[in-house]
Amino acid sequence: DASGDLLNTEAHSAPAQRWSMQVPAEVNAEAGDAAVLPCTFTHPHRHYDGPLTAIWRSGEPYAGPQVFRCTAAPGSELCQTALSLHGRFRLLGNPRRNDLSLRVERLALADSGRYFCRVEFTGDAHDRYESRHGVRLRVTAAAPRIVNISVLPGPAHAFRALCTAEGEPPPALAWSGPAPGNSSAALQGQGHGYQVTAELPALTRDGRYTCTAANSLGRAEASVYLFRFHGAP
């Protein structure tokens, strides 16, 4: 909290290159979205071009679990990913240009917490530095949103309906329609992170079928209409 920090003014402007890392105190994002965790650094090793490793860890500096790691060969600007937890972490910055900024995809509430960037020079200039204070990622909950609703052909000339919604916490899905009791026929499909899919396996009557997604932050509805063509007798 900024109220506890002491303000400062520049006392002298000598451009010394020492180890330092610049990260914002906080980054805010909504569940399901992506967030960028900025991190830039300065170092005392002029024109360092040797091998380097960029690391991000969560929870605690120095000791917390790594969520991302990449390594750049001598002279290379490409940092080859060696670890990306759940495949959701990607380096945006160029470590050769003192930028370790990280992109986190498909945010969930559980991603909230502190993240710490670290750079290691593993060549002749054997040195490393890690941000002690880190950036606090705040992931806020998201109200439900229906992202897809569709009717597809099913077995034996029947039809089925699919509804995909997203939200955090993951929403509960329910189908309702013209046939009595078919709301209970909704099969809760595989949830992928913050996305949930429910299937209504057999649409037995023409009419409107409504998918409702609800979580603690709200609800969303979407409908699809089934009208089968009946030929003349």
Partner: antibody, heavy 118, light 108 residues
Framework: QVQLVESGGGLVQPGGSLRLSCAAS????????MTWVRQAPGKGLEWVSF????????YYADSVKGRFTISRDNSKNTLYLQMNSLRAEDTAVYYC???????????WGQGTLVTVSS | DIELTQPPSVSVAPGQTARISCSGD??????ASWYQQKPGQAPVLVIY???KRPSGIPERFSGSNSGNTATLTISGTQAEDEADYYC??????????FGGGTKLTVLG
Amino acid sequence: QVQLVESGGGLVQPGGSLRLSCAASGFTFSNYWMTWVRQAPGKGLEWVSFISYSGSTTYYADSVKGRFTISRDNSKNTLYLQMNSLRAEDTAVYYCAREGTSSMFDVWGQGTLVTVSS
Amino acid sequence: DIELTQPPSVSVAPGQTARISCSGDALRSYYASWYQQKPGQAPVLVIYDDNKRPSGIPERFSGSNSGNTATLTISGTQAEDEADYYCASFTYMSDFVFGGGTKLTVLG
């Protein structure tokens, strides 16, 4: 206002133990690294120990490693220093300090005196 | 052990400029901070990140760091500036080190 208040100092015999406390107020305690620094009578400042936000990460000066333990209780906004196997050379005023978001200690307590003597 | 070396004492006439040096290998890689301590009181941060001044610290205090030597400069020194001054820095192993301290005497 931002404030740190140490307590728990006193006279203790060599080989004895003492626990220092540092009560923090006026800022969000759990957002900061904290440290202990000591100063022997008539001598300079000596860094003793660091502790990270949650307490999972700690560092110690070689002179106290294995004898002193730094800890914190964020629910009580309090920093601790458990001192065991005390020696005469541990006699000092002990300060707790807050590490700012840069490489420095921006807030200090008033200090508490620990005397190790038989 | 990593050390920071300061002169034990520096004297200056009122209104003149006082310079206190601090040297050590850590200063090639890490920022210096400076603390002022008056008798019977806790230290007070006067400079951090080599040259930044916390709010409430007079403009006459400034800092620099070149090579392995950091310098605290007090321009137009006043009687109230008489105190012990300590430089400090992080070290490679995430430890922290203080210089031995410099006693600043304001003559007169």
